[in-house]
């Protein structure tokens, strides 16, 4: 039962994270939550950084600055892969949740 619950939590978190991405950066509250998660957990996107390509409000050569290894204003514009966190947040935060929840 614990595993089923955990999988359900992960699935919900994945869906919720992707939903929040769709609202980025239009919704300031959403943006600050996502930015905080990406910066704190050193991750980018849901599965990985390429998820940001699919967000209509984001230019295809851009990720949020919070994805950068060294966060500075504009660092996500025309990004180079070596300068950003490539791992997805669902797996990264999910691992933390599994250990701590």
């Amino acid at each position: 039962a614990g595993y089923v619950f955990r999988d359900k939590v992960m699935s919900e978190f994945n869906n919720n994270f992707r939903q929040q991405m769709e609202n980025y950066p239009k919704n300031n509250h959403t943006a600050s939550i996502l930015d905080r998660m990406q910066a704190d957990f050193k991750c980018c996107g849901a599965a990985n950084y390429t998820d940001w390509e699919k967000i209509p409000s984001m230019s295809k050569n851009r990720v949020p600055d919070s994805c950068c290894i060294n966060v500075t204003v504009g660092c996500g514009i025309n990004f180079n892969e070596k300068a950003i966190h490539k791992e997805g947040c669902v797996e990264k935060i999910g691992g933390w949740l599994r250990k701590n929840v």
Partner: antibody, heavy 119, light 108 residues
Framework: QVQLVESGGGLVKPGGSLRLSCAAS????????MNWIRQAPGKGLEWVSY????????YYADSVKGRFTISRDNAKASLYLQMSSLKAEDTAVYYC????????????WGQGTTVTVSS | DIQMTQSPSSLSASVGDRVTITCRAS??????LNWYQQKPGKAPKLLIY???SLQSGVPSRFSGSGSGTDFTLTISSLQPEDFATYYC??????????FGQGTRLEIK
């Protein structure tokens, strides 16, 4: 020294195929995005395609979409452009170009290889 | 797509002249603007990146300025080797990477 050397250009009939190669040396290939940029005779510069460090991200100009395929072999420090269904308007010098991205410009260009599409 | 428009298309000048080439973007590109020089039969060469930063090895007579939509490339005192074609290019929003149509600088 830092170098990009293109090869594979030549004369091809309309509808034909060609594969361009670019050998990189003198730098860490995986640190860079790579581009193909072309220049038709007497014309300006036209971006064709780019590929990310890992090869996860690739994009094409509308004029070549569905006909050209960009790829890279990081172990061989090589960039490729597979061109098919070639048209007369694809006739150009094709340059392999290194791109550090961010706010830096495209800082290293190959010497170019000429592709001529004619019957 | 962001369009880049250069002016003039061609320009005649003499050695020692001060020359300015302009580039206009169809929307704001912040400072994500680069300038290249191309001589006949040769590959382009990066001169200026980020609108105003001089690429290593480029003579200091070359300078760039501007941000947003309007940019300029200035050659303070033309040398014989500066006669070439110059292109601007934006990297703010890609794909596509877009270039200006070029400015041909000729000897008067």
């Amino acid at each position: 020294q830092v170098q990009l050397v293109e090869s594979g250009g030549g004369l091809v009939k309309p509808g034909g195929s060609l594969r361009l190669s670019c050998a990189a040396s003198g730098f860490i290939f995986t640190d860079y995005f790579m581009n193909w940029i072309r220049q038709a005779p007497g014309k300006g510069l036209e971006w064709v395609s780019y590929i990310s460090n890992s090869g996860n991200i690739l994009y094409y100009a509308d004029s070549v979409k569905g006909r050209f395929t960009i790829s890279r072999d990081n172990a061989k420090a090589s960039l490729y452009l597979q061109m098919s269904s070639l048209k007369a308007e694809d006739t150009a010098v094709y340059y392999c170009v290194r791109d550090p991205r961010m706010f830096y410009g495209m800082d290293v260009w190959g010497q170019g290889t000429t592709v001529t599409v004619s019957s | 797509d962001i369009q880049m428009t250069q002016s003039p298309s061609s320009l005649s000048a003499s050695v020692g002249d001060r020359v300015t080439i302009t580039c206009r973007a169809s929307q704001s590109i912040s400072s994500y603007l680069n300038w290249y020089q191309q001589k006949p039969g040769k590959a382009p060469k990066l001169l200026i990146y980020a609108a105003s930063s001089l690429q290593s090895g480029v003579p200091s007579r070359f300078s760039g300025s501007g941000s947003g939509t309007d940019f300029t490339l200035t050659i303070s005192s033309l040398q014989p080797e500066d006669f070439a074609t110059y292109y601007c290019q934006q990297s703010y929003s890609t794909p596509p990477i877009t270039f200006g149509q070029g400015t041909r600088l000729e000897i008067k």
